[in-house]
Every structure is written in structure tokens, then in C-alpha cells.
Amino acid sequence: CDLPQTHSLGSRRTLMLLAQMRRISLFSCLKDRHDFGFPQEEFGNQFQKAETIPVLHEMIQQIFNLFSTKDSSAAWDETLLDKFYTELYQQLNDLEACVIQGVGVTETPLMKEDSILAVRKYFQRITLYLKEKKYSPCAWEVVRAEIMRSFSLSTNLQESLRSKE
């Protein structure tokens, strides 16, 4: 399964929208900095596109879930948020089409469960952090910057997989 060229354009648009969503300077939120333990290993230790697709799907699904909460709607510009949802939704569709075609159903599907679980736990830590910080503007800014970083890392992997083929 070849992910359409529009998929990587969509990833770039998603990052651009995340950048545009910034409301306050991260420098004013230095006291709220936090290490969420992004499981980078899960995006670097699988060498076949087939193995990364379900993990990337989980990543995007979790970003979608995180930003489609009531608390998120109150934190961000509604127009940008709607565009953001649309981009994520399209990427999920692209990845799902690949899974349906049989990519991702390889000999070792169980090994991907570890990676998917690790991604879920990462987002669980983000959710706990927001709750702990009472969804403050600084907490959301820290999370927005973190999602930009982790999304960028995971999409870089997609690009490197595409170029290997």
C-alpha cells in the first residue's frame, strides 16, 4: 500500500495548523515544562512500513481524541481546530485504507501491541498532566508544543520509510 502524496502534505498542514494554534509564548510557561516520555523507540525500531502503520494510526487517533475534548475546544481557536480535525481525519482514513489492504497484518502482529500500548500510555500521561494543571493556558501550550514535536518525529519516520522503497 502506497500512502498517497496528499498524506505527507496533510502531515505538513497538520504541523502548520498546530504552529498557528499557539496562543501564548512557551517561554512564559517554563515552570510548566514536562517530560512526557514520548516512546520514540516505537517509531524507530520497526523497519517495515507494514509494522509502523498501526502505530502511526494510534498516534493520530490519540491526537484526535486529545484535541476533540470539551476542554480543548475552550482552549483553542474554533476555526483552526476544525481545520485540524479535518486534516487528522483524512490521515486516519489514509492509514485505515492501508490496514484494510492487508498492510500491518504481518507475521508478528503481537509485537505491535507493545508499541500501540506505549503510545496509549504516552497520551495517558498527557491527559493526567492537563488534569493536574487544571487545563491552564500554559499546560495546553506545553501540550501543543509536545504534540508538534512528537507528531513531527513520527511523520519523519513515515518519510524515511517512503524514501527507502
Epitope: 514536562h34 523507540e41 525500531n45 507493545d114 508499541s115 506505549a118 500521561r125 498532566y129
Partner: antibody, heavy 122, light 107 residues
Framework: EMQLMESGGGLVQPGGSLRLSCVAS????????MSWVRQAPGKGLEWVAS????????YYAPSVKGRFSISRDNSNNTLYVQMNSLGVEDTAFYYC???????????????WGQGTLVIVST | DIRVTQSPSSLSASVGDRVSISCQTS??????LNWYQQRPGKGPQLLIS???TLQSGVPSRFSGSGSGTDFILTIISLQPEDSASYYC?????????FGQGTKVEIK
């Protein structure tokens, strides 16, 4: 009875290699992440590495990354750590540990083996 | 990496005394802080997980509290068999990190 039994420790020269094994019994090994934790004689505890329940996720302490490799064989209920380029600072008791969940982080280390001693010396 | 600081490094108390050990983390770990007991010549044993959850078989004189960055292990009434080293550990993210340990001695 739940049990973890380490083996493979011993004396090795600096720069040498060693492979430790840990056989698990009394619980569903394939359902839990596993770790290696070490303790230099008379010192505190240091986490070394973790592996997810299915062997797909592997995490390492910065002090061992690139030298140690953790793996597991769920069909034989066995956890391994391959240790290369050993230095005197790796001298310690190595404990095989069961985690409370299927994948590392946000977990506790709820069951420990008796430990196996690794001595790196000339 | 998350730094874990434990204090005191050692303490001496009498049987029946109330004993507290403190643990601080360099960033919030929510409630993902665990406590272990290690008796001389033995492997560690999990006492308390998730800051305050007592493991089965652990006497009720042990209790844990705290969240975020500050945690406490309390032994309400010290017993002779509690003579051991105690370690806290953050299980929030890898690398897992432990406190330096607290050696508890009976006077």
C-alpha cells in the same frame, strides 16, 4: 508459586561479554513487561532495561544503551540480557523483575528474583 | 531523566516508633511512585505502588501518601522485622529512577 530464577552470572574480564537468563514460573509470563535491575555491592538500585510483554518494546538505561540487549522467549518463559563491552562499573547483582503491566512505564516492579552476581575484573 | 531524591539516607528508631521517609521527584510523576523494602542479603520487595496502594501481604502499619513531586512512606509502629533499606522509584517514564535508599535500623 510465582518465581523468577536468574542464571549466567560470574567473573568476566573488562571488555568481555556475558548473557544472563531468567526463567519465570507461576504466572502468565507473556502478559507482562519484564525488567533487569542491578545493584552494585553495598549500593542502591539501578534500572537497566525493560521489554514489553510481546518483545516489541525495548527500553534501556543511558549507562547501558548500545552495549546491552534485552530479549525474551515467551514460549520458554525466559528473559535474557546480552551484555557486551563490560566495564568494572557493571559489577553488580542483576535482578530479573516482573512489571505490573504489559508495557513499560507507569508501572511498579512487583516481583523480583534472587539476583545473580556479575563481577567484571582483571 | 527524572531525578529522585530520598531522605534521610539512614535513621535509627525504637520499636513502636512512627517513622517517615521522604521522596521527591524532579518533575511531577502524578501518583506513579513506588516503594520497596530490601532486607539484608535479599532481593527487594514491592511494598506500595501508585503512591498509596499497599501490596497484598504487606502489614497495614506501612502507608504511602503524596502525589506530583512529594511523597512519604510511613511506618506507623516500627517492628524489629522492619530493619531494612527502603527505596522509592518513579514508574512514570523510562528510564525508571530510584531514590538513593534509606537504611532503617532498630535502636
Amino acid at each position: 508459586e510465582m518465581q523468577l530464577m536468574e542464571s549466567g552470572g560470574g567473573l568476566v574480564q573488562p571488555g568481555g561479554s556475558l548473557r544472563l537468563s531468567c526463567v519465570a514460573s507461576g504466572f502468565t509470563f507473556k502478559s507482562f513487561a519484564m525488567s533487569w535491575v542491578r545493584q552494585a555491592p553495598g549500593k542502591g538500585l539501578e534500572w537497566v532495561a525493560s521489554v514489553g510483554s510481546q518483545g516489541g518494546s525495548k527500553y534501556y538505561a543511558p549507562s547501558v544503551k548500545g552495549r546491552f540487549s534485552i530479549s525474551r522467549d515467551n514460549s520458554n518463559n525466559t528473559l535474557y540480557v546480552q551484555m557486551n563491552s563490560l566495564g568494572v562499573e557493571d559489577t553488580a547483582f542483576y535482578y530479573c523483575v516482573k512489571e505490573t503491566d504489559a508495557v513499560a512505564t507507569m508501572d511498579a516492579l512487583d516481583m523480583w528474583g534472587q539476583g545473580t552476581l556479575v563481577i567484571v575484573s582483571t | 531523566d527524572i531525578r529522585v531524591t530520598q531522605s534521610p539516607s539512614s535513621l535509627s528508631a525504637s520499636v513502636g516508633d512512627r517513622v517517615s521517609i521522604s521522596c521527591q521527584t524532579s518533575q511531577s510523576v502524578n501518583i506513579y511512585l513506588n516503594w520497596y523494602q530490601q532486607r539484608p542479603g535479599k532481593g527487594p520487595q514491592l511494598l506500595i505502588s501508585a503512591a498509596s496502594t499497599l501490596q497484598s501481604g504487606v502489614p497495614s502499619r506501612f502507608s504511602g501518601s503524596g502525589s506530583g513531586t512529594d511523597f512519604i512512606l510511613t511506618i506507623i509502629s516500627l517492628q524489629p522485622e522492619d530493619s531494612a533499606s527502603y527505596y522509592c522509584q518513579q514508574g512514570y517514564i523510562t528510564p525508571y529512577t530510584f531514590g538513593q535508599g534509606t537504611k532503617v535500623e532498630i535502636k
